[in-house]
């Protein structure tokens, strides 16, 4: 019989460069069996991660893989910064690698990052 | 339960490859990543290299170039190649699964021994 | 990449006494660190994931602590079947390992 485990799957040091003032969604891929575990996005800050209980937060579906995804209405300066997302699974946490933010303010632009930057999602289906 | 098995002992001669092969079983390989870490012996663990669940990798930089994983799904068994061999080499050679947050190895092989000599 | 210096390299601890191994990052790694034991003639298992989780199994006088660059494995009360070698690992960005320490009954 096959283990089925609840899994994360952001990559190491994984990172987005975004522009403040722009909507962004930030996925964790998640892979379950039955139930769909219950999830949470915490910013990091110092030695703990504090927990965005107040941040709209929405699941897609697709066929393979499941993301939870945190959104920024719009992305303000201070969500610069490293996120991790987390499951809770018959009793267990697992945590993901964090996966960084790094926000431009729009004053300080001197030029928007590209529309390839902008869509790639460099933690797809593995970590 | 979640076995993870190597392919057993080679002797090869500097210069030639060695393909060690890990077959899995308890757990799907396109669910998990593995691993490969090698120890000389009566030394220290050096991770190689892993295969993510989509089959892309990620490999030490001190073995890029001369290191290649793959896996193969439907025979649940991820394979590691070694080119360029040298007697720095001869090690044993471990696959292990990630966790599923992929941020520690929870399960590993028993090994595959390879000595390079001429 | 990031080097993890363990300390010390090797370690003689009387039975129930405490043994407390060291692990130092040359840059932080977050609580990315997972700690190893490796008895003679086998294969790694895990201990500790996350810094300080104590895996699946692993008897609790197994104790994991730290954060950012430096880490802490403590046994707090050694058992024979404890003597083996102890291996650190960050896999905050590609996995590196400790040299290991080798814990031996005096």
């Known amino acids: 019989k096959e283990s089925c485990d609840v899994q994360l799957y952001i990559k190491r040091q994984s990172e987005h460069s975004i522009l403040a003032g722009d909507p962004f969604e930030l996925e964790c891929p998640v892979k379950y069996c039955a139930n769909r575990p219950h999830v949470t996005w915490c910013k990091l800050n110092g030695t703990t991660c504090v927990k965005l209980e107040d941040r709209q937060t929405s699941w897609k579906e697709e066929k393979n893989i499941s993301f939870f995804i945190l959104h920024f209405e719009p992305v303000l300066p201070n969500d610069n910064g490293s996120y991790r997302c987390s499951a809770n699974f018959q009793s267990n946490l697992i945590e993901s690698h964090s996966t960084t933010l790094y926000v431009t303010d729009v004053k300080s632009a001197s030029e928007r990052p590209s529309k390839d930057e902008m869509a790639s999602r460099p933690w797809l289906l593995y970590r | 339960q979640v076995q993870l098995k190597e392919s057993g002992a080679e002797v090869k001669k500097p210069g030639a490859s060695v393909k060690v092969s890990c077959k899995v079983s308890?757990?799907?390989?396109?669910?998990?990543?593995v691993n490969w870490v090698r120890q000389a012996p009566g030394q220290g663990l050096e991770w190689m290299g892993m295969?993510?669940?989509?089959?892309?990798?990620d490999y030490n930089s001190k073995f890029q170039g001369r290191v290649t994983m793959t896996k193969d799904n439907s025979k649940s068994t991820v394979y590691m190649e070694l080119s360029s061999l040298r007697s720095e080499d001869t090690a044993v050679y471990y696959c292990?699964?990630?966790?599923?947050?992929?941020?520690?190895?929870?399960?590993w092989g028993q090994g595959t021994m390879v000595t390079v000599s001429s | 990449s990031i080097v993890m210096t363990q300390s010390p390299d090797s370690l003689a601890v009387s039975l129930g006494e405490r043994a407390t191994i060291n692990c130092k990052a040359s840059?932080?790694?977050?609580?990315?660190v997972a700690w190893y034991q490796q008895k003679p003639g086998q294969s790694p298992k895990l201990l500790i994931y996350?810094?300080?989780n104590r895996y699946t199994g692993v008897p609790d006088r197994f104790t994991g602590s730290g954060y950012g660059t430096d880490f802490t494995l403590t046994i707090s009360s050694l058992q024979a079947e404890d003597v083996a070698v102890y291996f650190c690992?960050?896999?905050?960005?590609?996995?590196?390992f400790g040299g290991g320490t080798k814990l031996e009954i005096k």
């Open positions: 292990a699964r990630d966790r599923p947050d992929g941020r520690a190895m929870d399960y």
């Open positions: 308890g757990f799907s390989l396109t669910g998990y990543g």
């Open positions: 295969i993510w669940i989509d089959g892309s990798t």
């Open positions: 840059q932080s790694v977050s609580n990315d």
């Open positions: 996350y810094a300080s």
């Open positions: 690992q960050q896999d905050y960005s590609s996995p590196t």
